[in-house]
């Protein structure tokens, strides 16, 4: 049903869903702090623009009695229950910030009027792609998929002279929410990744993964997995690995690789790490102290969600336009705004663009080094290290199929 919005007469409210089931196990207090810090900035920006208006956030908490798994498994109904709560209280703001689980966002989007924008820190899955009033501020699975296809096809770099068309994907079901949906997208038979590859098999057991490492009859030399170095070590240990195996470790929200004193452990030498360009430092923030890198990105997405709303509110108010319209709801895309940590660009579908970085372990220095970067906005790869000190033969990435010559 249509709910009246607290979104006019110089008073603009943001509805923030504080869900027990979340993409990252982050204390809600930290997210509240992030939102409040964002509000202070937005108020300053509006005041500076001569707009004498009030902007506030209402935090909507679920009771946590039924939906208490803490992860995203029971988030579908929790999201709808919170919407019902908003509806009953007639307390809808101009914008909804909050659902981070793919399940909850998908269901809430289906079951609600499209008259207000939704901003999500998460909602990584393909089922949340191409939603007209949904904005996602953490890299969704589609962006990862496009990088992988682009990289697989690349064959004109000094360190990658073969196109690849095959891959194993390791997915054992214990992944974090972001990894779950990234791997889910690679596994899906109808996805762009599957469509572009000639061979792809999902490895679901630790033993399957371990056996492939030295299997002479393997169908691909490339294995994609998602998680941090410790996750890989638990699985791989110090097992021998065939010299032409390449493990692609997707670890987007982790900037530990760029810290000065970090040395790559020996088991990372056959690994290329895909992460995001560093920068989510949040050095001066009250809410960011003692946060792990992943949680910092999550809190940052909440903060940037507030700044995005402020950016759009400012534009609409300066143009004398109404906020409670479909035009406003559909406007949160195809733009760049000043985020807390630098410029934030949203694509035509409201998904954040970023620079992904592919790292390798230098056999000389045992440090992580940047091999290439990838701009998700233009779907383009930029080589950085033209003479990498790889573990692989001739300092080149091997073919994806053993024994197959140049193509």
């Amino acid at each position: 049903s249509q709910v009246s919005q607290n979104c006019h007469n110089g008073s603009y409210e943001i509805s923030v869903l504080m869900m027990g089931n979340s993409a990252f196990a982050e204390p809600l207090k930290n997210l509240e702090d992030a939102v409040n810090e964002g509000l202070e900035i937005v108020r300053g920006r509006l005041q500076n623009a001569g707009l004498n208006v009030t902007v506030n956030a209402t935090f909507m908490y679920s009771d946590g009695l039924i939906h208490n798994s803490g992860d995203c498994r029971s988030s579908t109904c929790e999201g709808l229950d919170l919407l019902r709560k908003i509806s009953n209280a007639q307390r809808m703001g101009c914008v909804l910030i909050g659902p981070s689980c793919t399940y909850s966002t998908f269901q809430m989007y289906l079951d609600t009027e499209l008259s207000y924008p939704m901003i999500s820190a998460g909602s990584f899955g393909l089922s949340c792609d191409y939603k007209e009033t949904l904005t996602r501020l953490m890299s969704p699975a589609r962006k990862l998929m496009y990088f992988l296809v682009n990289f697989w096809k690349t064959n004109d770099l000094p360190f990658k002279t073969y196109s690849w068309s095959t891959s194993y994907v390791y997915k054992n079901g214990t992944e974090t929410e972001d990894c779950f949906w990234y791997l889910n997208a690679l596994e899906a038979s109808v996805s762009y990744f599957s469509h572009e590859l000639g061979f792809k098999v999902v490895l679901r057991q630790d033993k399957e993964f371990q056996d492939i490492l030295m299997d002479h009859n393997r169908k691909s030399n490339v294995i994609i997995m998602c998680g941090g170095p410790e996750f890989l070590y638990k699985l791989k240990g110090d097992r021998a690995v065939a010299e032409d195996i390449v493990i692609i470790l997707v670890d987007l929200f982790n900037d530990q690789y760029f810290e000065d004193n970090v040395t790559a452990p020996d088991y990372m030498k056959n690994v290329l790490v895909l992460t995001l360009s560093p920068g989510n430092s949040l050095l001066n923030s009250s809410f960011s102290r003692n946060l792990s890198p992943t949680k910092r990105d999550f809190a940052l997405a909440y903060l940037n969600g507030i700044l995005l709303f402020g950016h759009m509110l400012k534009i609409f108010l300066e143009n004398g336009e109404n906020i409670t319209t479909p035009k406003f709801a559909h406007a949160f895309r195809n733009l760049t705004f000043e985020g807390y940590d630098g410029p934030v660009t949203l694509d035509d579908w409201g998904d954040v663009d970023s620079t992904m970085v592919l790292l390798y372990t230098s056999v000389d220095t045992k440090k992580y080094k940047v091999l290439l970067t990838y701009d998700t906005h233009v779907n383009k790869t930029y080589p950085v290290d033209m003479s990498p000190t790889f573990t692989w033969k001739n300092s080149k990435l091997p073919n994806d199929i053993t024994g197959r010559g140049p193509q």
Epitope: I41, G44, Q47, N48, N280, S281, Y340, G342
Partner: nanobody, 119 residues
Framework: QVQLVESGGGLVQPGGSLRLSCAAS????????MDWYRQAPGKQREMVAT???????TYTDAVKGRFTISRDNAKNTVYLQMNNLKPEDTAVYYC?????????????WGQGTQVTVSS
């Protein structure tokens, strides 16, 4: 009324150091990142360094490893610490703050402070 006031410029020998300051109105300082630009005689104004609200900084290649931008939230001030100065760093240095305009620079400028590197 938005105000940006730079200070700290002067004459210094090659290899020397200077610290520039830019004091800003609080409503601007707390709402946006801030930039330092410079303009050498007869040249275009160029960006030197940016500091975002988070404290993250970015630099032009010519000054990387020599210049450090920082912000003091208690004093609403941004600093540019310039070490190992070279003659080619000679320029008027400007502080730039506020929302980004259509021309991709920020809305407000300081009056500039002269830095001369010469023996």
């Amino acid at each position: 009324q938005v105000q940006l006031v730079e200070s700290g410029g002067g004459l210094v020998q090659p290899g020397g150091s200077l610290r520039l300051s830019c004091a800003a109105s609080s409503n601007i300082f707390r709402a946006y990142g801030m930039d330092w630009y410079r303009q050498a005689p007869g040249k275009q104004r160029e960006m030197v360094a940016t500091i975002w609200l988070s404290g993250r900084s970015t630099y032009t290649d010519a000054v990387k490893g020599r210049f450090t931008i920082s912000r003091d939230n208690a004093k609403n001030t941004v600093y540019l610490q310039m070490n190992n100065l070279k003659p080619e760093d000679t320029a008027v240095y400007y502080c730039n703050a506020g929302p980004t305009t259509a021309s991709s620079v920020r809305q407000y400028w300081g009056q500039g402070t002269q830095v001369t590197v010469s023996s």
